[in-house]
Structures are given as C-alpha cells and as structure tokens.
C-alpha cells in the first residue's frame, strides 16, 4: 500500500517546510484516497468488463450510494459551507459500510482496499474537527449496516463484481465533488 499522506519522500526531503494547515491536510488526504481508488479500479477493470458498461446501464441498481444533490449546498449554485460540510461527513459515514464490503473483494490490492478504508476514517475525523454543526450529522444505524453487508455478500459473483465497480465509481465521484467544494471553503 502507498505511504499515508505526510510521510511521502517529498515530505522527508523538506524537513523545514511549514506544517500543513487543516485544509491542506484534508486536501492531501482526499487525493491519497483517490489514488487508492484508482488502483482498486484498475484491478476491477482488469478482472471484469464492468468498466465498459454505460453509466445508464449501471444506474439500474438498488444500491443507495451517497450522491451529491443541489440541495446539499456543495455546488456553485446554492453553495453553503455548513450544509455542504454536513453532507460530506454524512456521506462518508454512509460509505463506510460499502468500504467494509470491499475488504474481501481484492486479491492483489487487498492492502490498498484496507488503506482506502482506514484513510476514510481519518478523513472523517479531520472533517468533524472542521464542522461547527456536528448535531446535524446523522450516523448510520449499525444494525441496518450489518444486514446490508450480509445482503451484499450473499449476491452472486456477477452482482458482486457490479457492486464493487459501482461503489468505487460512486465513491470517487463523491470525493471529487467534496474536494471541489472544500477548495471553495
């Protein structure tokens, strides 16, 4: 697995550099997770032909993956820093069960899948420190998550491949939208 942010060779080579600000740390953390997703997508795409499927075909699924909408305040029209931050944190918490599902889905990238999961937990902590309105953040119900995980793991091989692909693609899009919004804050 790649070295976590803050420990790469560039950082070692520049010991006198200013410490990262909270925003820079979050930015770097998200880019690190995106790199991990990219590596996982490579393995998924090499293994199955899911990546060639059109977005429309893949949209016909019963996964309730977090997605940014206009009302969430993360797009330029209707941009709202606090509403958006709540959506980002809530969405990441909702993705956690899907990241757990990914843990046994990779052969050569098992460590990478773990790194994405653990880095997301760290990212959530970073963002919670930034948020003023923590009360507005709803945490997913563990029992519901457990039954969802069981249901996903009971799918046939083709559906599991499809689910893996959809999770990675949706998580990537969610992180990209989140980071673009965070760069406005």
């Amino acid at each position: 697995a790649p070295v976590p942010p803050g420990e790469d060779s560039k950082d070692v080579a520049a010991p006198h550099r200013q410490p990262l600000t909270s925003s820079e740390r979050i930015d770097k953390q998200i880019r690190y997770i995106l790199d991990g997703i990219s590596a996982l997508r490579k393995e998924t795409c090499n293994k199955s032909n899911m990546c060639e499927s059109s977005k429309e075909a893949l949209a016909e699924n019963n996964l309730n993956l977090p997605k940014m909408a206009e009302k969430d305040g993360c797009f330029q029209s209707g941009f709202n820093e606090e509403t958006c931050l709540v959506k980002i944190i809530t969405g990441l918490l909702e993705f956690e069960v899907y990241l757990e599902y990914l843990q046994n889905r990779f052969e050569s990238s098992e460590e990478q899948a773990r790194a994405v999961q653990m880095s997301t937990k760290v990212l959530i902590q970073f963002l919670q420190k930034k948020a003023k309105n923590l009360d507005a953040i709803t945490t997913p119900d563990p029992t519901t998550n457990a039954s969802l995980l069981t249901k996903l793991q009971a799918q046939n091989q083709w559906l599991q491949d499809m689910t893996t692909h959809l999770i990675l693609r949706s998580f990537k899009e969610f992180l990209q939208s989140s980071l673009r919004a965070l760069r406005q804050m």
Epitope: R31, L34, F75, Q76, K172, E173, Q176, S177, L179, R180, R183, Q184
Partner: nanobody
Amino acid sequence: QVQLVESGGGLVQAGGSLRLSCTASGGTFGEYAMAWFRQAPGKEREFVTDIGESGGTWYADSVKGRFTISRDNAKNTVYLQMNSLRPEDTAVYYCAADSYGVGGGAERYYDSWGQGTQVTVSS
C-alpha cells in the same frame, strides 16, 4: 501528464462572442478536470472556470452568465464559449488540467498547462 493546445483566440469587438478550444493528448482526457485561467497585461493569472470529471462546473463571478465551459470527451476537447465580451476580458487564456478530476480556483491544483491563446476585446 497531458499536453494541451489552445485555439480560437483573436480580436473581437465589445459585445461580441468567441469560442476557445483546448485539445488534449497523452492522457485519459475524460478523467481530468479541465479549467480556463486568464492573464491580463501586468496582472496575475486568474481563474475563469472549470469542469470536473463528472461534469460539475464553477465560474468566477466576473464571467458568470456570460461564459460557458463544456467538454467533449470523445474529441479530447474542452471549450469556452464567451459571450457579451468586454474590454476587461482582454487577456491570454490558458487551459489547465487536473489529473485528480477535481479542479479548483487556484493554479496549484493543476498539473498540466497549455501555452495560451490571446483574446483582445476592443471598445
């Protein structure tokens, strides 16, 4: 990294329109966020607009409602449609790409840049 080449600049009268194009080669274009920046004589380079991998767009307040960014992934090209041009839009326009597909309003978010194309708006 991708190589970027801008085109479509020129001289236009105030109130007129221009469409800039930026064609990319050497990367998976559809996975990049693309942006336009501009630099007027004697000024810093400034953000104009960007479009993310999934199509979300952001605009600088000064161009909102007049400029439109779009992309054609099949042609590896991003466009900037500029309407109701003003003399203060005169600048060299640069295309930039972010390999993370995110974009942002600062130069540091982009890892590839074009050479720029001159846009002059006369009054």
